[in-house]
């Protein structure tokens, strides 16, 4: 039986959720008037880049859209982007699609996502509402890199 991705709403400790704005992901306050994205998460079958200390390797997509999270270097800086891609197309590939891969690690009840292509760079939200979801190598006060994966199904 073919695996199916798991579905989650994603929220940070300031009760910000991920929202699709055009073809970008932004963080916005949890609110009835805002429709948070449902994140699709599925494990990568290829073990080429695996590192158990960093977590499980996963692909991340947006449910209901052929969009997946993707890391690329822009002007020398690792950047988080959305790329038109069906998450199951990534999953069925025999070879790991490195730019789309993230190490998913649990820290207490929270989840942390680290880029496989750019070790030490983590998915983050700013403390300011309406800002894009981005990659950072500075974990701490100004950036939030710990997320709650809320079951929505």
């Amino acid at each position: 039986r073919e695996a199916a991705p798991k579905s989650y709403a994603i929220r940070d400790s300031r009760q910000m959720v991920w929202v699709l704005s055009g073809n970008s992901l932004i963080a916005a306050p949890l609110s009835r008037s805002i429709k948070p994205v449902t994140l699709h998460l599925i494990a990568c079958r290829d073990t080429e880049f695996s590192d158990k200390e960093k977590g499980n390797m996963v692909y991340l997509g947006i449910k209901g859209k052929d969009l997946c999270l993707f890391c690329a270097e822009i002007q020398g800086k690792p950047t988080l982007q959305l790329k038109e891609k069906n998450i199951m197309d990534l999953y069925v590939e025999k070879k790991a699609q490195k730019p789309f891969l993230f190490f998913h690690n649990k820290e207490g009840s929270t989840s942390v996502f680290q880029s496989v292509s750019y070790p030490g760079w983590f998915i983050a939200t700013s403390t300011t509402s309406g800002q894009p979801i981005f990659l950072t190598k500075e974990r701490g006060i100004t950036n939030n890199t710990n997320f709650y994966l809320d079951s929505v199904e």
């Epitope: 709403a9 300031r14 609110s31 009840s109 509402s129 809320d150």
Partner: antibody, heavy 122, light 111 residues
Framework: ELQLQESGPGLVKPSETLSLTCTVS??????????WGWIRQPPGKGLEWIGS???????YYEPSLKSRVTISVDTSKNQFSLKLSSVTAADTAVYYC??????????????WGQGTLVTVSS | ESVLTQPPSVSGAPGQRVTISCTGS?????????VHWYQQLPGTAPKLLIY???NRPSGVPDRFSGSKSGTSASLAITGLQAEDEADYYC???????????FGGGTKLTVL
């Protein structure tokens, strides 16, 4: 239908620890996306949020009370509890437990217990 | 002092319309967190009256309505009735405090 019921001593001595329990019926305290809070109301005054715990076990406390407050969950009894240490007369209040769901009530509280009066006095 | 500011009291005659304001800041209402309203009848626990700025839970009469703009919100009650005499509280979330915040409450007197 979800229901909440507070219980605990009505009288606590100054400098001691106030301990209250909220029993949840009609639903599970581990249900996804729910948060459970404690709110108090001093006599003749307004509502004051004390702190919350959610289904992940994450706790959030009112900054001015943080050093004195502990909120925890007992899943086996379907209860959550409040401990407030080093109490003074200023902690005399009706204490309410309340709940909501992140994706249904959006950080509001839609179910409340009936409240229990705690008096701090020697 | 409460993080959200409400008038201490408002009053109106039966059948009239009254509004109760709730003023916050850029870290709560102004940051687009929802505002919720509670009614507390004398000697009873608060009851959710409006959630998500302008939504009524089932069983709440449509005489009650909520709205939000900028850093403020308001609760309107039309066709005022004697049984509406109660304390009303607004509530939101404040990201700078990482917590829930209440207004100081407004006592509604039906004349």
């Amino acid at each position: 239908e979800l229901q909440l019921q507070e219980s605990g001593p009505g009288l606590v001595k100054p400098s001691e620890t106030l301990s209250l329990t909220c029993t949840v019926s009609g639903g599970s305290i581990t249900a996804s996306n729910y948060y459970w809070g404690w709110i108090r109301q001093p006599p003749g005054k307004g509502l004051e949020w004390i702190g919350s715990i959610d289904y992940t076990g994450s706790t959030y406390y009112e900054p001015s009370l943080k050093s004195r407050v502990t909120i925890s969950v007992d899943t086996s009894k379907n209860q959550f509890s409040l401990k407030l240490s080093s109490v003074t007369a200023a902690d005399t209040a009706v204490y309410y437990c309340a709940t909501g769901s992140y994706y249904e009530t959006y950080l509001g509280f839609d179910v409340w217990g009936q409240g229990t009066l705690v008096t701090v006095s020697s | 002092e409460s993080v959200l500011t409400q008038p201490p009291s408002v009053s109106g005659a039966p059948g009239q319309r009254v509004t109760i304001s709730c003023t916050g800041s850029s870290s709560n209402i102004g940051a687009h967190y929802d505002v919720h309203w509670y009614q507390q009848l004398p000697g009873t626990a608060p009851k959710l009256l409006i959630y998500g700025n302008d939504n009524r839970p089932s069983g709440v009469p449509d005489r009650f309505s909520g709205s939000k703009s900028g850093t403020s919100a308001s609760l309107a009650i039309t066709g005022l009735q004697a049984e509406d005499e109660a304390d009303y509280y607004c509530q939101s979330y404040d990201y700078s405090l990482s917590g829930y915040v209440f207004g100081g409450g407004t006592k509604l007197t039906v004349l």
